[in-house]
């Protein structure tokens, strides 16, 4: 904390300008009026204050606004945002998307910091849901943002927001998250025709159930192996050899390279070897001819 000393004669700041970069910390504390700083916050970011000087300016704002800064000040924090703690940010009420964008811009190119995570949390909670414009903004700055949310948090994403999602935004999502997002995507894209629909829904298919995969297999979609490998194992297992062949189209040849990996490995174990042989890929591990397959789970359900 900078000790309180009187401002030297002639150094009282009449406006926030470049001359202040020559002030020592104690001079900033003594000579810059907090109310002046608050009204001219938009100038601070353009002035190359050192991080130590920014500490002093933050201290002045903290004294002026002990209950949290007003949005008019928050919007113009610029580099001063980097000095804020999550505790500081929890006192804020950020409602404007422009404010959110301005602060995310300061942190651009860096990992999501605890400050940014807190800011986003405050913003989204204030809005009540992740609307399209917010999601657009967040994924533009942090492509992995969507996958950092819990399934519960994702449930507040309206289907209309799904249009903002790009394939790379889902790269780090796990199956639990895709289970929540897939039905929303299906709803969002329901009015599109076959090929366009597949292009849009493709990145969400890790949450698709068996019946939807069967339906896709009837539409000549030619799913690539990378997408197939991300499908839920439990959704792939009931598919027949013919259905997988239709689903993958010319990409079916890629199954050979993936035969030891899930879900291909588990799917192979469920197919008749005769049927697998029809693919001509040399896939091994299917059920030998003449063997009877009992579905014990079905038997238990009946008894």
């Amino acid at each position: 904390e900078v000790e309180k000393t009187a401002c030297p004669s002639g150094k009282k700041a009449r406006e926030i300008d470049e001359s202040l970069i020559f002030y020592k910390k104690w001079e900033l504390e003594a000579c810059v009026d907090a109310a002046l700083l608050a009204t001219q916050m938009d100038r601070v970011n353009a002035i190359p204050f050192t991080y130590e000087q920014l500490d002093v300016l933050k201290h002045k704002l903290d004294e002026l606004y002990p209950q949290g800064y007003p949005e008019s000040v928050i919007q113009h924090l610029g580099y001063l945002f980097l000095k804020m703690s999550p505790e500081d940010i929890r006192k804020w009420n950020v409602t404007s998307l422009e404010t959110l964008k301005a602060l995310l811009e300061v942190n651009k190119g860096h990992e999501m910091s605890p400050q940014v995570a807190t800011l986003i949390d405050r913003f989204v909670k204030g809005r009540g849901q992740l609307d399209k414009d917010t999601l657009d903004t967040l994924t533009a700055f942090y492509p992995g943002y969507l996958c950092s949310l819990s399934p519960e948090e994702l449930s507040s994403v309206p289907p209309s927001s799904i249009w903002a999602v790009r394939p790379q935004d889902l790269d780090t999502c796990d199956p639990r998250q895709l289970d929540v997002l897939y039905p929303k995507a299906r709803l969002a894209f329901q009015n599109m025709n076959g090929s366009e629909y597949f292009v849009k829904i493709q990145s969400f298919l890790g949450g698709a159930p068996t019946e939807d995969l069967k339906a896709l297999s009837q539409q000549n979609v030619s799913m690539d192996l990378a997408t197939f490998m991300k499908l839920r194992t439990d959704a792939v297992l009931p598919l027949t050899v013919a259905e997988v062949q239709k689903l993958l189209g010319p990409h079916v040849e890629g199954l050979k390279a993936e035969e030891r990996h899930r879900p291909v490995r588990d799917w192979i174990l469920r197919q008749r070897q005769d049927d697998l042989d029809t693919l001509g890929l040399g896939l091994q591990g299917g059920i030998p001819n003449g063997y009877l397959v009992l579905d014990l789970s079905m038997q238990e359900a009946l008894s």
Partner: nanobody
Framework: EVQIVESGGGSVQAGETLRLSCTAS????????MGWYRQAPGDECELVST???????NYADSVKGRFTISQDNAKNTVYLQMTSLKPEDTAIYSC?????????WGQGTLVTVS
């Protein structure tokens, strides 16, 4: 990687002259505003002088009329010509891009005026 090397410091008598040099690499020098900072023993960091990419200069009140900042873009070097030195100019002098917002940090070059 941004690298900055300051040199030219030393011990002099009051009233004498020194010229500090700061050679930089790892960034576009002629697009950058540069500054000389100093920190005296037991005191806090202070900005002494700045030079912007267009060549305009600014000085702290305490050195106006005695210090001159200049740059040679071809050599990626900023200079601080210090005349009429006083004992209160004794400090470690550091050179920085203003955009770094770091101030007094790193090696610097020591100037001692007796």
């Amino acid at each position: 990687e941004v690298q900055i090397v300051e040199s030219g410091g030393g011990s002099v008598q009051a009233g004498e002259t020194l010229r500090l040099s700061c050679t930089a690499s790892g960034f576009t020098f002629d697009d950058s505003d540069m500054g000389w900072y100093r920190q005296a023993p037991g005191d806090e960091c202070e900005l002494v002088s700045t030079i912007s990419s267009d060549g305009s200069t600014n000085y702290a009140d305490s050195v106006k009329g005695r210090f001159t900042i200049s740059q040679d873009n071809a050599k990626n070097t900023v200079y601080l010509q210090m005349t009429s030195l006083k004992p209160e100019d004794t400090a470690i002098y550091s050179c920085r891009t203003m955009a770094s917002r770091i101030g007094c940090w790193g090696q610097g070059t020591l100037v001692t005026v007796s």
